[in-house]
C-alpha cells in the first residue's frame, strides 16, 4: 500500500514556542515596568520593599553562561506561578487603595497566565520534567493595613520585574542551544 500518509504540521514547534515565550516575556516585562512606574507615581516608595513569600531571584549575570534548558524553564515556571499567586492575592486583598490599578493588574494576570501556558507547552514538547520542586507554599494572609498592601504591591512588581528581566536573557541564550 506504500508509505503511510504523513501528518500536517501543527501550529508551532519547540523553537517557535521558545520565540513566543520570549515575546510574551518581553511584553510582560514592559507591562510590569509601566505598572511599577504608575505605582511609584501614585504611592511613592520609601526605599526597597520585600515580601518573605516571594521567590528569591534565580539568576545573576554571572550564572547566565552556565544555564541549562531544563533548569531555566522549571525555575522560571515555578517562580512565575508564585508571582501569579501574589498578583491574584493583590487583586483580592489589596483594598481600596489598589482598586484604581485593577484593570492593569487584571491584564498583568492574564498575560502571566498566557506565558505560563506557553512555557508548559514548550516543556511538554521537549519532554522535560514539569513537576515543580516541592517548595513550602507560604499562605498569604490579608495585608496588615492599606500601607501594607501598597508595600506588598511594590515588592511584587519589583520582584516580577527582576525575574522577567533575567528570564528574557536566559530564554534568548537558550534559543541558541535548541
Amino acid at each position: 500500500p506504500g508509505p503511510p500518509a504523513g501528518s500536517p504540521r501543527v501550529s508551532s514547534d519547540p523553537r517557535a514556542d521558545l520565540d513566543s515565550a520570549v515575546l510574551l516575556t518581553r511584553s510582560l516585562l514592559a507591562d510590569t515596568r509601566q505598572l511599577a512606574a504608575q505605582m511609584r507615581d501614585k504611592f511613592p516608595a520609601d526605599g526597597d520593599h520585600s515580601l518573605d513569600s516571594l521567590p528569591t531571584l534565580a539568576m545573576s549575570a554571572g550564572t547566565l553562561g552556565s544555564l541549562q534548558l531544563p533548569g531555566v524553564l522549571t525555575r522560571l515556571r515555578v517562580d512565575l506561578m508564585s508571582y501569579l499567586r501574589h498578583v491574584q492575592w493583590l487583586r483580592r486583598a489589596g483594598g481600596p487603595s489598589l482598586k484604581t490599578l485593577e484593570p492593569e493588574l487584571g491584564a498583568l494576570q492574564a498575560r502571566l497566565e498566557r506565558l505560563l501556558r506557553r512555557l508548559q507547552l514548550l516543556m511538554s514538547r521537549l519532554a522535560l520534567p514539569q513537576a515543580a520542586p516541592d517548595q513550602p507554599v507560604i499562605p498569604l494572609g490579608p495585608p496588615a493595613s492599606a500601607w501594607g498592601s501598597i508595600r506588598a504591591a511594590h515588592a511584587i512588581l519589583g520582584g516580577l520585574h527582576l525575574t522577567l528581566d533575567w528570564a528574557v536573557r536566559g530564554l534568548l541564550l537558550l534559543k541558541t542551544r535548541l
Epitope: D13, R15, R117, Q120, S124, L126, A127, L128, L178
Partner: antibody, heavy 114, light 111 residues
Framework: EVQLLESGGGLVQPGGSLRLSCAAS????????MHWVRQAPGKGLEWVSV????????YYADSVKGRFTISRDNSKNTLYLQMNSLRAEDTAVYYC???????WGQGTLVTVSS | QSVLTQPPSASGTPGQRVTISCTGS?????????VNWYQQLPGTAPKLLIY???ERPSGVPDRFSGSKSGTSASLAISGLRSEDEADYYC???????????FGGGTKLTVL
Amino acid sequence: EVQLLESGGGLVQPGGSLRLSCAASGFTFSSYGMHWVRQAPGKGLEWVSVISYDGSYKYYADSVKGRFTISRDNSKNTLYLQMNSLRAEDTAVYYCAAGVPDYWGQGTLVTVSS
Amino acid sequence: QSVLTQPPSASGTPGQRVTISCTGSSSNIGAGYDVNWYQQLPGTAPKLLIYSNNERPSGVPDRFSGSKSGTSASLAISGLRSEDEADYYCAAWDDSLNGPVFGGGTKLTVL
C-alpha cells in the same frame, strides 16, 4: 509533511524480547520529546514511555518499568524501544509520537503469545 | 482503569452540538496542566485535535473547541457531521507519572 514510521513489531513468545524503531522525517527531530504509546486490541490509549529532546530524561509507565528501555539517536532521526521479558498483556499496537504528542505514527503491532 | 475519566459513549444527530467531558485529579488537570484532545477514526492512528486546552492545530475546523476549569475539561463539537464519528481521547501531563495520562476514550456516534 511530518512522518513517523514504526517498525520491529511481530509475534514473540512470553519472556521474549523485541526492539521497535521509529524513523522520523519532516520536522526537527532533535527539538522534540518523543513518546511510545500503546493500544491493546479494542482498548484505549496507554502511555508507555517518554524521552526528552536530548535524551537526558526518560520516564516509564509503572506497567513497563524495568522491562522496557527507550532511547534515541538524533543523528539518525530515530527513536527506539527495547522490550524485554514480554508478557501477554503487552500485546498492542505501539505508536511512536512526537511532542505534546503533536504527531503520531501509524503504529506497529506487537503480539505476545505462545 | 484510566487516570482521566471520560464517558464511554456519546451521540448526536447531524448539525447538533455534542460535548464530551474529561475529569482528572490534583496531579494532572487540577495541578494546572493543560489538556489535549485526540481524535481516532476507525482503523487509524490518533490525531491531535486540541492542545493547550483550547488551541486548534492548523487544519482542524473551528467546529471543534476545548475548555478547562478546575480538575475538568471538555470538548465541544458543533454542527456535527457523519465524518466526526470516531473515538475521542483527552490527555494531560501527570506529576506522579512524569508523562501524559489519557482518558479511557469516548466513542462518538452520529445517528
